[in-house]
Interface confidence: low
Amino acid sequence: GITIPRNPGCPNSEDKNFPRTVMVNLNIHNRNTNTNPKRSSDYYNRSTSPWNLHRNEDPERYPSVIWEAKCRHLGCINADGNVDYHMNSVPIQQEILVLRREPPHCPNSFRLEKILVSVGCTCVTPIVHHVA
Amino acid sequence: GITIPRNPGCPNSEDKNFPRTVMVNLNIHNRNTNTNPKRSSDYYNRSTSPWNLHRNEDPERYPSVIWEAKCRHLGCINADGNVDYHMNSVPIQQEILVLRREPPHCPNSFRLEKILVSVGCTCVTPIVHHVA
């Protein structure tokens, strides 16, 4: 493989081999060149498995506000606009990284945390278990 | 809002009010007590707006592997198993935080980065534009 030399401009650390704690620059670089389509879209309303967005706020976490999707129905909306219970609305979940203040209430030290969030809902064919 | 007193045990920093660079503990705390449902579920196949998962790998990023959803069809799957083009399969997108080495190849300094990922797809009623 290609040898990648250690950058001589790296910050110092007490243990260069295995830092348990690293420096993280909070000037977030945004790779999204376009406006976030999710925010501007109304998919949550137009979907056959519509959802509501619930605000989850935690000042000890970064980002402090996360929007959680909750499916509106157990079933899905059919062509007539009614709920069809032969289909299921289910949440699409994703594991995301957040920063948690640690020790609590400290402005400049954090711990990485993984949390599971529901991003939206999709309509699926149910798994039917037949009793013998 | 509630005033949360500053913890006297906080690490020192040059600018306590607006840290640009913070210390982050890498012992990741996983708040997901159960196995990630997204990974174990087959919603991507059972959905009326099914999707494929594409692997996006970047060793200089954490997480290094991110799975991107791509909707299989423009339309949605109807009760007969056919694609109905009167409906649209659309990606549900979410902005997530990742860590990127900065400066490059440094073992202990990172920058937060926001990227937009497609987590799955949902079936929506199309917006029809009528020409006058």
């Epitope: 493989g1 290609i2 990648i4 830092p19 | 990741i28 790998e57 954490y62 997480p63 290094s64």
Partner: nanobody, 119 residues
């Protein structure tokens, strides 16, 4: 699907040697640092050794320095741990782990191979 499969463990007398292997698949092996981690009976996970992507840099926990050697063969997608002068306290299940850019963080590890050092 990331897969890490360890082999080479077994029963050995104190002072003896073993060579552990780890076959990797499902990811670009040559792009990642790799680790050996171990878990002694009734104890927590302990990091043992790390090797950088190209094998140029290697690091060891103090207790194995001079006795254990980590190596890799990127052409074969394989990781190795040569263990010499084994001691009773080296008895553990040894896991091979895929490194991330975050030091000491492992997203994936194998099922492990048991090393027992006993007379």
């Amino acid at each position: 699907q990331v897969q890490l499969v360890e082999s080479g463990g077994g029963l050995v007398q104190p002072g003896g040697s073993l060579r552990l292997s780890c076959a990797a698949s499902g990811f670009t092996f040559s792009s990642y640092g790799m680790y050996w981690v171990r878990q002694a009976p009734g104890k927590g996970l302990e990091w043992v050794a790390e090797i950088k992507q190209d094998g140029s840099e290697k690091y060891y926990v103090d207790s194995v320095k001079g006795r254990f050697t980590i190596s890799r063969d990127n052409a074969k997608n394989s990781l190795y741990l040569q263990m010499n002068s084994l001691r009773a306290e080296d008895t553990a299940v040894y896991y091979c782990a895929k490194g991330e850019i975050l030091p000491l963080y492992f997203d994936y590890w194998g099922q492990g191979t048991l090393v027992t050092v006993s007379s």
